[in-house]
């Protein structure tokens, strides 16, 4: 049970000595600088104090400084991730210092006592940028903190106890068990950093989630709800690992984070965009596709700074795999009469002719129940850029012939037996582009003919006054 | 054990300023949060603020801004809470407490009266 | 600022009975609540965090439950020693706010 998970290693038990840790030779965390392009070079590890070494290693005090930080570790080896996150920082900041803190150590033990060791490795990464901030022309505003799973509560702990404001700390996936509300200075918060930006992969509403449940940062962003990633799934992992095991689906999703960063920074061209939302659900009603007043910013890398008090949820759809931008659509569908509807809510797909493509059959999943004489609002989107929107088509796909269906009918038959088929009355549709903030007025082609029943399709056509744009430039142009 | 001892009781007058003291052993003490919080007579608990005396950080809650001020002596794992431009419903017991999964540990409390 | 609205402000009640104290946040703080008990000329004691984590030494009468905005404090045999002010506070985020407190008295 959670219980098992409680805190511990703390000021009432004074575990101010790193837990678990081997008596060997090797420092129990490491600064090792990545200088070569080569991912399997070993790189220079600095030394606290040794100015002559930082000399030595290349240490740009002017440049931007990254540290990454891993999380807890089953195997004591760095993990595939850390090597194409070093390259691509070094591809996009070419002067910056890219340096990993290796705790491994500390790291491979029993999760509880890797949990208890992050307040001291946090406390030497702090003690290294304090250090650092005795040289003049380091600034600790050029300090980008970037910390995956577990490395993201030390990410925490550093910018909590270095003297000053670190400039951001990134989030990936934060740890959740033992950090899911715990007080503000155990856990990774937006105090740490002058910009503190956090992804949700993996956060399960159920059972013990891997990452971190609540917003830890000044914008915490939940691809695909925060929860079941595209590609991961356990189809997914039987057929690109060996063995498709539960870990595996579990270390797809909260590696997720990982790569969605690395995506921000590689495939710049494609920016991902995430747009706040109160909640995952509403997200998915596409009610919350808007970029007004700061509500909605690229991800990873590029994420804009926020000034906001209080914290920002945001959410957006991705792909399963690089790059993972999709286009967001949000359609708003006022639905007259639905005639016949017994239980059974109608299966409807969309699909969306633009300049550019066409997108595939498009499912508009309903949330919760469709409203009638009432407008109905749905998420859709598309993995390629469709251009402007041109027209549509609804399909109302045929009800399967099972025996649940047919009574169901048949009920419906019994109930309303002058008007036994199943109809939706659908004049116009509102489409929204998440990523350009575009909107534009579809209206059926011929007015007289505006109902649909399974089996059936509607065609839309751009109504009279055609696109419609509130701001004469879209807001992603300045984000991008 | 962890023990916080709090400076003994103080009568100002308004205007005046406050300066309470809280002398910590049994942790390390660069390492926690220490927070002041105040109970007023027959009322509730309100926190003031913190520091965190390894790196001498603040968080103040503003409605004390500008007239609280929270620093540490390393060498006598001491923090001091000064409250200045003091009024007459500033009276309370001051208390300081060190933070960890809460206020874990809480010293024994300062009585600060304003009267004139 | 996060507000904690606390309920009953004082109860009356027996040894052994079961009481529960209730406190609302005016957003959601997720798990991040603490309990505290105070007894008069007394400094505050901490009894439960992270919502239902008993702190050391807490007797396993007293339990805590809930998350987002709406959390409870449960004493589910109340003895001699348990008359006395309860707070729940916030820790999700700065400033840390506390509720009005709930008053125990013996019926």
């Known amino acids: 049970s959670i219980t098992t998970l409680r805190p511990q290693g703390s000021l009432r038990d004074e575990h101010h000595k790193p837990t678990g840790v081997p008596a060997t030779a090797r420092p129990s965390v490491a600064f090792n600088i990545r200088t070569s392009k080569d991912p399997e070079q070993e790189g220079c590890n600095l030394s606290l104090g040794d100015s002559k070494l930082l000399e030595n290693c290349g240490f740009n005090m002017t440049a931007k400084t990254f540290f990454i930080i891993h999380g807890w570790t089953m195997s004591g080896m760095f993990e595939s991730w850390l090597h194409k996150l070093v390259s691509a920082l070094q591809m996009r900041e070419k002067d910056a210092n890219v340096v990993v803190v290796d705790w491994l150590p500390l790291a491979h033990q029993l999760y509880t006592d890797a949990v208890n060791n992050t307040r001291v490795v946090g406390q030497r990464v702090a003690g290294m940028l304090d250090w650092l901030q005795e040289k003049e022309e380091f600034s600790l505003g050029n300090v980008h903190l970037i910390g995956y799973s577990l490395g993201a509560h030390v990410a925490g702990y550093a910018g909590n106890f270095v003297k000053g404001t670190v400039g951001r700390i990134t989030g990936l996936d934060p740890a959740g068990p033992m950090f899911e509300g715990v007080d503000i200075n155990r856990r990774l918060s937006p105090d740490d950093a002058d910009f503190v930006d956090v992804l949700h992969t993996y956060t399960l509403s159920f059972g013990l989630s891997i990452g971190i449940r609540m917003p830890v940062g000044h914008i915490d962003i939940y691809p695909n709800g925060g929860d079941f990633q595209p590609g991961c799934g356990f189809n997914d992992v039987i057929g690109s690992f060996a063995y498709g095991t539960i870990s595996e689906m579990v270390k797809c999703e909260h590696e997720r984070a990982v790569h969605l960063f690395v995506d921000s920074l590689v495939n710049q061209d494609k920016p991902s965009f995430a747009f706040q939302c109160t909640d995952s659900s509403r997200f998915k009603r596409g009610i919350c596709l808007s970029c007004r007043k700061n509500r909605c910013n690229n991800i990873g890398y590029n994420a804009k700074k926020m000034r906001k008090k209080r914290n920002s949820k945001m959410y957006l759809k991705t792909r399963a795999g690089m790059p993972f931008k999709v286009y967001h659509y949000q359609l708003k569908v006022h639905m007259f009469s639905y005639n016949n509807s017994g239980d059974t809510q109608p299966t409807l797909y969309i699909t969306l002719y633009g300049s550019n493509a066409d997108s595939q059959n498009l499912p508009l999943e309903i949330v919760e129940k469709i409203e009638l004489n009432a407008t109905n609002t749905f998420l859709v989107y598309t993995e390629e850029d469709l251009g402007d929107l041109l027209k549509m088509r609804l399909t109302w796909e045929g009800v399967a012939h099972s025996w649940y269906n047919l009574w169901n009918e048949f009920r419906n038959y019994l109930s309303q037996p002058s008007n036994p088929s199943r109809e939706l009355y659908i004049r116009r549709i509102r489409v929204k582009s998440g990523e350009t903030q575009r909107k534009v007025t579809f209206c059926t082609q011929d007015p007289t003919k505006s109902s649909i029943s399974p089996g059936q399709e509607l065609w839309f056509h751009k109504c009279q006054d055609g696109w419609k744009m509130k701001n004469k430039t879209s807001p992603f142009v300045n984000l991008a | 054990q962890v023990q916080l001892v709090q400076s003994g009781a103080e009568v100002k007058k308004p205007g005046a300023s406050v300066k309470v003291s809280c002398k910590a052993s049994?942790?390390?003490?660069?390492?926690?949060?220490i927070a002041w919080v105040r109970q007023a007579p027959g009322q509730g608990l309100e926190w003031m603020g913190e520091i965190l005396p390894g790196s001498a950080k603040t968080k103040y809650n503003k409605k004390f801004k500008g007239r609280v001020t929270m620093t540490r002596d390393t060498s006598t794992s001491t923090v001091y809470m000064e409250l200045s431009s003091l009024r007459s419903e500033d009276t309370a017991v001051y208390y300081c407490?060190?933070?960890?999964?809460?206020?874990?540990?809480w010293g024994q409390g300062t009585t600060v009266t304003v009267s004139s | 600022d996060i507000q904690m609205t606390q309920s009953p402000s004082s109860l009356s009640a027996s040894v052994g009975d079961r009481v529960t104290i209730t406190c609302k946040a005016s957003?959601?703080?997720?798990?991040?609540v603490a309990w505290y008990q105070q007894k008069p000329g007394k400094s505050p004691k901490l009894l439960i965090y992270s919502a239902s984590y008993r702190f050391t030494g807490v007797p396993s009468r007293f339990s805590g439950s809930g998350s987002g905005t709406d959390f409870t404090l449960t004493i589910s045999s109340l003895q001699p020693e348990d008359f006395a002010t309860y707070y729940c506070q916030q820790h999700y985020s700065i400033p840390r706010t506390f509720g009005g407190g709930t008053k125990v008295e013996i019926k």
């Open positions: 957003q959601d703080v997720y798990t991040a």
């Open positions: 049994g942790y390390t003490f660069t390492t926690y949060w």
């Open positions: 407490a060190v933070y960890d999964y809460g206020a874990d540990y």
